[in-house]
């Protein structure tokens, strides 16, 4: 259930994020952690619906 580093902010996150490219912001502890520590739905095979629409590069929310 893990994606690789999210190196770019998308239009989804207008405010700057405090994390370096290999990290993601953990909303609960309020600091950056390795992206692999946080659950995000894995990509489904082509043609299958994913739990939430996500692009290859995601905002560090």
């Amino acid at each position: 259930m893990r994606r690789g580093p999210r190196s770019l902010r998308g239009r989804d996150a207008p405010a700057p994020t405090p994390c370096v490219p290999a990290e993601c912001f953990d909303l609960l502890v309020r600091h950056c952690v390795a992206c692999g520590a946080l659950r995000t739905p894995r990509p489904k095979p082509a043609g299958a619906s994913s739990p939430a629409p996500r692009t290859a590069l995601q905002p560090q929310e």
């Epitope: 259930m1 996150a13 520590a37 946080l38 739990p51 939430a52």
Partner: antibody, heavy 118, light 113 residues
Framework: DVQLQESGPSLVKPSQTLSLTCSVT????????WNWIRKFPGNKLEYMGY???????YYNPSLKSRISITRDTSKNQFYLQLLSVTTEDTATYYC????????????WGAGTLVTVSS | DIVMTQTPLSLPVSLGDQASISCRSS???????????LHWYLQKPGQSPKLLIY???NRFSGVPDRFSGSGSGTDFTLKISRVEAEDLGVYFC??????????FGSGTKLEIK
């Protein structure tokens, strides 16, 4: 697909300890936040607490010092203990996984009704 | 803790009607990162809650387009344009901006008139 299943006794006597297990398949509990939420008769949902990828915990202050959430990573299970229960702890108990990008509960167990009664 | 106030508690509707549920938070749900973590769940009878809408207005995978979410700050609305029988159940709003703890609205029971 990730699946969660709660298990434990459906009837607990007042003053005793409520103990539930959440078994997770399809994902590792060493990633993300794993949560307990309960629903009282009358539809009120209460967030109870979590255990995180690192093993750290958070407990809702409303539960004071009665609650403990632990895990066994070798079994991919996490646990709820609620001490000194009263009839007001009668509820349906859910375990749930938290999406780490949009921060919603993306996967829930079916829930288990626990009745506190003598 | 953030208090989520949902109205109405009960919403009797006729099939095909529009339904509207309001959710108000005790503080703004705009996070310092600019995102608003306000979500809507539906709990059908005998089932666990399922996500409908995330971050105010984004439909979760598989959710019909008759469901829409809107709002900002402290005031949010879930609309169902044409209610179908499968939509019956209890709707909850929830916030993930000021956490922990996560908090939920009191629930709105959508039922047939």
């Amino acid at each position: 697909d990730v699946q969660l299943q709660e298990s434990g006794p459906s009837l607990v006597k007042p003053s005793q300890t409520l103990s539930l297990t959440c078994s997770v398949t399809g994902d590792s509990i060493t990633s993300g936040y794993w949560n307990w939420i309960r629903k009282f008769p009358g539809n009120k949902l209460e967030y109870m607490g979590y255990i995180s990828y690192s093993g750290s915990t958070y407990y809702n202050p409303s539960l004071k010092s009665r609650i403990s959430i632990t895990r066994d990573t070798s079994k991919n299970q996490f646990y709820l203990q609620l001490l000194s229960v009263t009839t007001e702890d009668t509820a349906t108990y859910y375990c749930a996984g938290l999406d780490g990008l949009y921060w919603y509960f993306d996967v829930w167990g079916a829930g288990t009704l626990v009745t506190v009664s003598s | 803790d953030i208090v989520m106030t949902q109205t109405p508690l009960s919403l009797p509707v006729s099939l095909g009607d529009q339904a509207s549920i309001s959710c108000r938070s005790s503080q703004s749900l705009v996070h310092s990162n600019g995102n608003t973590y306000l979500h809507w769940y539906l709990q059908k009878p005998g089932q666990s809650p399922k996500l409908l809408i995330y971050k105010v207005s984004n439909r979760f995978s598989g959710v019909p387009d008759r469901f829409s979410g809107s709002g900002s700050g402290t005031d949010f609305t879930l609309k169902i344009s044409r209610v179908e029988a499968e939509d019956l159940g209890v709707y909850f709003c929830s916030q993930s901006t000021h956490v922990p703890p996560f908090t939920f609205g009191s629930g709105t029971k959508l039922e047939i008139k």
